[in-house]
Amino acid sequence: EVEKTACPSGKKAREIDESLIFYKKWELEACVDAALLATQMDRVNAIPFTYEQLDVLKHKLDELYPQGYPESVIQHLGYLFLKMSPEDIRKWNVTSLETLKALLEVNKGHEMSPQVATLIDRFVKGRGQLDKDTLDTLTAFYPGYLCSLSPEELSSVPPSSIWAVRPQDLDTCDPRQLDVLYPKARLAFQNMNGSEYFVKIQSFLGGAPTEDLKALSQQNVSMDLATFMKLRTDAVLPLTVAEVQKLLGPHVEGLKAEERHRPVRDWILRQRQDDLDTLGLGLQGGIPNGYLVLDLSMQEALS
């Protein structure tokens, strides 16, 4: 806390300008009116205040707005935003996307800080859902944002917002998250033709069920190995050799290099060796000829 001392004669600040950088902490506290600071917040970013001086300015705003800052002040916080704690930010009511953008700009190019995470959480909760414009903004600043959400949070993403998602936005998503996002993407892109549809849906396929993969195999999509390796193992296992061959097209040759890795390894173990041999890739580990395959999961379901 800064002690309350009278402002020296002639030092009362009439505006927020560079002369204030020469003020000591106690002079800033005594000579800068909090209401003046609030109305001229946009000037702070152009002034090289010290960290200590920023603490004083923050303290003045905290005194003026003990219940939380108004959005008109929040929008112009600039780098003073980085002096805010998550507790401070939880008091705010940020509704404007412009305010969100202005504050994200302050931390642009850096990892998501606790302040930014809290701000985004407040903003999204205030909106009730993650609409397209918000998602556009968040993924522009933080490509990994979508994958930082829980499956429960992702369930509030409307299918229309999926149009804003770029492939790199899904790079760090795990299967549980893709399970939620895939049906939304399928719905969002349903009116597109075959090749265009595949281009859009491709990065979401880690959440696709077997029947959708079977359907894709009939459309000459030529899925690359990188996409195939991200598919759910349980969705790949029921695919026949012919279906995988059609799904991958010319990329089928890449299976050999991946035969020891999931899901390829597990899929090979489920195929007849005869069928695998038809690919001419030298894939080994299939079911030998003459062996009967019992589907135990089916048997358990029946009993």
């Epitope: 152009a46 002034i47 090289p48 205040f49 010290t50 960290y51 200590e52 001086q53 920023l54 603490d55 780098y79 980085l82 002096k83 704690s85 190019g109 850096h110 800080s113």
Partner: antibody, heavy 119, light 107 residues
Amino acid sequence: QVQLVESGGGVVQPGRSLRLSCAASGFTFSSDGMNWVRQAPGKGLEWVAVIWNDGSNKYYADSVKGRFTISRDNSKNTLYLQMNSLRAEDTAVYYCARDRGPLWPLDYWGQGTLVTVSS
Amino acid sequence: DIQMTQSPSTLSASVGDRVTITCRASQSISRWLAWYQQKPGKAPKLLIYKASSLESGVPSRFSGSGSGTEFTLTISNLQPDDFATFYCQQYQSYSRTFGQGTKVEIK
């Protein structure tokens, strides 16, 4: 007068860790931001990391993100750089330097400590 | 990150010469630019900050100018003590990137 003294450098194998320290005196350490800057032999200066006065904000160069951690102990007037998963290209003289605010230059520098990453 | 490009990389000059070094930023950094001097085996020393403000104790033969993306450091009357490497650095962004350096050597 302001003094910054780095220590903790030495020879280390690739993949290993090292912690550098910077002891500060002659100014109110808890009021100012602190940076690490490095210089590979015969090369230019490369900014590595900054930590704000109260430790609330830390920023890193892309080349060290996820491997290096900057921290400070204001009660001991000491700045640290924890370096993990070291690579040959991390070989450099490491300097600590002070800044007084987000829009301030690096006005005081230490003399540097040499880190050599080699097998 | 903001890229800083200095030119020339090396500059040969004589005592008494007027020397100019240029620094270019990949995006506008307003006037948040510093210049440092470094001698072999020594730590860098701050010469100029905020593009044109002279650091206390630095001789007035050093001057800086520019704003936005184009900046210059001028040494008006090169002295024997001035032969060194000079670096520009932006500090508008928290990633305070340096230029690659300009070595001023004796002609």
